[in-house]
Amino acid sequence: MAVTACQGLGFVVSLIGIAGIIAATCMDQWSTQDLYNNPVTAVFNYQGLWRSCVRESSGFTECRGYFTLLGLPAMLQAVRALMIVGIVLGAIGLLVSIFALKCIRIGSMEDSAKANMTLTSGIMFIVSGLCAIAGVSVFANMLVTNFWMSTANMYTGMGGMVQTVQTRYTFGAALFVGWVAGGLTLIGGVMMCIACRGLAPEETNYKAVSYHASGHSVAYKPGGFKASTGFGSNTKNKKIYDGGARTEDEVQSYPSKHDYV
């Protein structure tokens, strides 16, 4: 019951997280005009990953897409890539995790397969969350660097009569959405990985006997066929205890089969 709850909660948390990553990626407010010196402005600028916008005091908002690909900063391209990779991995993870949910029965799918799928989706969520956090952090770092550069520019070359207003940008709402969403996806992924431990099938004594009888030949090991499909449960020669309890390093053996994730 606890396993099902952990798995279900992990799925829901990851779902919210991925929805947040998608929202953050689409949002226009990745960077917003710094209003420190002028809290009420007649023209307010903000920028996203895909377009920049200007909101006038009149209430009119004009947004323009970045129609160039080669002319954009490499960092912005990198952030876009990280966010898209995060979304794609998250979406695949969600798809896999739906089939892995213990409360959903699909044909004669065995628990070992569900365990492996749960682990796969968990790892995908973790990587997805890390991609989002990395993307947002790279953008935030870019903003901080530009902020101090433009601040330095504001106080130079003002010897003449005419002053030029340098627009400085600070953190937009999308950054916070991205950080939170990435964190949630990461947490959801960890929960799925934890749930995976309790989902592995409880081997019977009969199977254990059968296993010992087969000696050390991998070909005749229980779950050997399943292992070849990528959804096996016991790939090491370990003693299977009554009641299905497992040793610590047996649990650690799971990720070794998921290098393809």
Epitope: Q33, N38, V40, T41, A42, V43, N45, Y46, Q47, S52, C53, V54, E56, S57, S58, G59, F60, E62, R64, V162, Q163, T164, V165, T167
Partner: antibody, heavy 118, light 113 residues
Framework: QVQLVQSGAEVKKPGASVKVSCKAS????????MNWVRQAPGQGLEWMGN????????SYNQKFKGRVTMTIDKSTSTVYMELSSLRSEDTAVYYC???????????WGQGTTVTVSS | DIVMTQSPDSLAVSLGERATMNCKSS????????????LTWYQQKPGQPPKLLIY???TRKSGVPDRFTGSGSGTDFTLTISSLQAEDVAVYYC?????????FGGGTKVEIK
């Protein structure tokens, strides 16, 4: 067509308050900010502030801060501008003006003359 | 506050001739976000409220004759009446629409020579 109709002329004593109204018609009232601009006799234009009829948010010229209050009545599509602690230098024609693209004022009221005299 | 300075104070031009007036701001009115200059030109005739001619420094409001042209960027702007008509006699104001408080120039009075 868009129309901004202002209240009639006012004569006030120094220290008193005046409340000028501006009734809008011919467009979606809450879709455009309303500004107030005054013009002293023979002088130039001076922006006083504006109000967002949708949210009710205001921006005032610091020069009038504390003396000017802008309010709205959505039910009648009317904007009000109240100026308190009147002085003789507040004698002017007060205009309401609708804010348009580029923060420009595309439609203006006919003006309300406020005379401050003892 | 952004200070708007208009020149000349008055301008006498013959009918059909070109009239040019200038407006200078103490700070740039160019917004980096959309590369638009937040400067507006108004025409005011005696006893009337101002009338919007040009916004974003060079965009003519619909219904405004094409003899009115706005130009300039940053801090220096110009309003040109290519062929002055009798009905163009008025005071012309420029306005900073970029930063609060919104400020107006002192005006340029256009008369017929």
């Amino acid at each position: 067509q868009v129309q901004l109709v202002q209240s009639g002329a006012e004569v006030k004593k120094p220290g008193a308050s005046v409340k000028v109204s501006c009734k809008a018609s011919g467009y979606t009232f809450t879709g455009y900010n309303m500004n107030w601009v005054r013009q002293a006799p023979g002088q130039g234009l001076e922006w006083m502030g504006n109000i967002d009829p949708y949210y009710g948010g205001t921006s005032y010229n610091q020069k009038f801060k504390g003396r000017v209050t802008m309010t709205i009545d959505k039910s009648t599509s009317t904007v009000y501008m109240e100026l308190s602690s009147l002085r003789s230098e507040d004698t002017a024609v007060y205009y309401c003006a609708r804010m348009y693209h580029g923060n420009a004022f595309d439609y203006w009221g006919q003006g309300t003359t406020v005379t401050v005299s003892s | 506050d952004i200070v708007m300075t208009q020149s000349p104070d008055s301008l006498a031009v013959s009918l059909g001739e070109r009239a040019t007036m200038n407006c200078k701001s103490s700070q740039s009115l160019l917004n980096s976000g959309n590369l638009k200059n937040y400067l507006t030109w108004y025409q005011q005739k005696p006893g009337q409220p101002p009338k919007l001619l040009i916004y974003w420094a060079s965009t003519r409001k619909s219904g405004v004759p094409d003899r009115f042209t706005g130009s300039g960027s940053g801090t220096d702007f110009t309003l040109t009446i290519s062929s002055l008509q009798a009905e163009d006699v008025a005071v012309y104001y420029c306005q900073n629409d970029y930063s609060y408080p919104l400020t107006f120039g002192g005006g340029t009075k256009v008369e017929i020579k």
